[in-house]
Amino acid sequence: NFPRTVMVNLNIHNRNTNTNPKRSSDYYDRSTSPWNLHRNEDPERYPSVIWEAKCRHLGCINADGNVDYHMNSVPIQQEILVLRREPPHSPNSFRLEKILVSVGCTCVTPIVHHVA
Amino acid sequence: NFPRTVMVNLNIHNRNTNTNPKRSSDYYDRSTSPWNLHRNEDPERYPSVIWEAKCRHLGCINADGNVDYHMNSVPIQQEILVLRREPPHSPNSFRLEKILVSVGCTCVTPIVHHVA
């Protein structure tokens, strides 16, 4: 059960420090549905910077390195929680906000009701 | 600039309501790197339920529907913010925590220094 307003310590505890092996992932480039990462910045939000994935192609990369339009590159999306200053510009008052972000892309077999 | 402790309204504002088009994604099943979703529950955390993706195969599904081990299914991970009750069981005091979650899987070409 959660009350409406709570106190939150912004001194972040990182539970990922023991991730092993550590790697700066290059999946965005090596995927059959590669993507680029775009910086989304909003000073009224915490975290203020979020990276959004945008699939590079409409189709997927085949074994020959060409785009195959019989398959579809699609974004994998996740709803995440962020803090939004409320009222705007408030130094220490926030509201939880749910936003949808694209994290990366995957290659899927087309659905029957394909747009094309 | 953010102070150390802030007030947060937990009445979530959902910015995704005007997403057009809306969809309940079945990519986990249609992907060439399909995944299963596992429920991770923790009453000391907000949100208390998080879904974790686990890739079904080491390889990727080819056009014949078989697993091709010349390609690798890999998880796409994202760091997200959650609220952790601090001290434990506290009704209205939390600390921000960063956790790594697997959102889905993508199919990648193997790296040169392959484990095999």
Partner: nanobody
Framework: QVQLVESGGGLVQPGGSLRLSCAVS????????MGWFRRPPGKEREFVAA????????KYADFVTDRFTISRDDAKSTVYLQMNSLKPEDTAVYYC????????????????WGQGTQVTVSS
């Protein structure tokens, strides 16, 4: 709220050309993909063309056969459809829309469309 404003339609003779424009506001324009669709008289809305966020990848419906070209200008938040060698069967109301799932986007999922722009090909 999102706004999609299509323009550039009109009456044109067979073999003629038109350039359609679609101005997008109320959302981040540079989404994954944008598309053009059309609704011929008495028929269902159908896919015409799609373009990826970078503008580097395009896909066309089979009936297009090298006659149409889709392009986008992120600075102007506008997507275009250059239509050449128009035929009477291209007569339709043309619409643009965001394609957040690329070619995987289904038309029955959309909740809103712009007002469209009428293209009539007739002698």
């Amino acid at each position: 709220q999102v706004q999609l404003v299509e323009s550039g339609g009109g009456l044109v003779q067979p073999g003629g050309s038109l350039r359609l424009s679609c101005a997008v506001s109320g959302r981040t324009f540079s989404s994954y993909a944008m598309g053009w669709f059309r609704r011929p008289p008495g028929k269902e809305r159908e896919f015409v063309a799609a373009i990826s966020w970078s503008g580097g990848d395009t896909k066309y419906a089979d009936f297009v056969t090298d006659r149409f070209t889709i392009s986008r200008d992120d600075a102007k938040s506008t997507v275009y459809l250059q239509m050449n060698s128009l035929k009477p069967e291209d007569t339709a109301v043309y619409y643009c829309n965001d394609m957040p799932y690329g070619l995987d986007t289904r038309m029955d999922e959309y909740e809103y469309w712009g007002q469209g722009t009428q293209v009539t090909v007739s002698s």
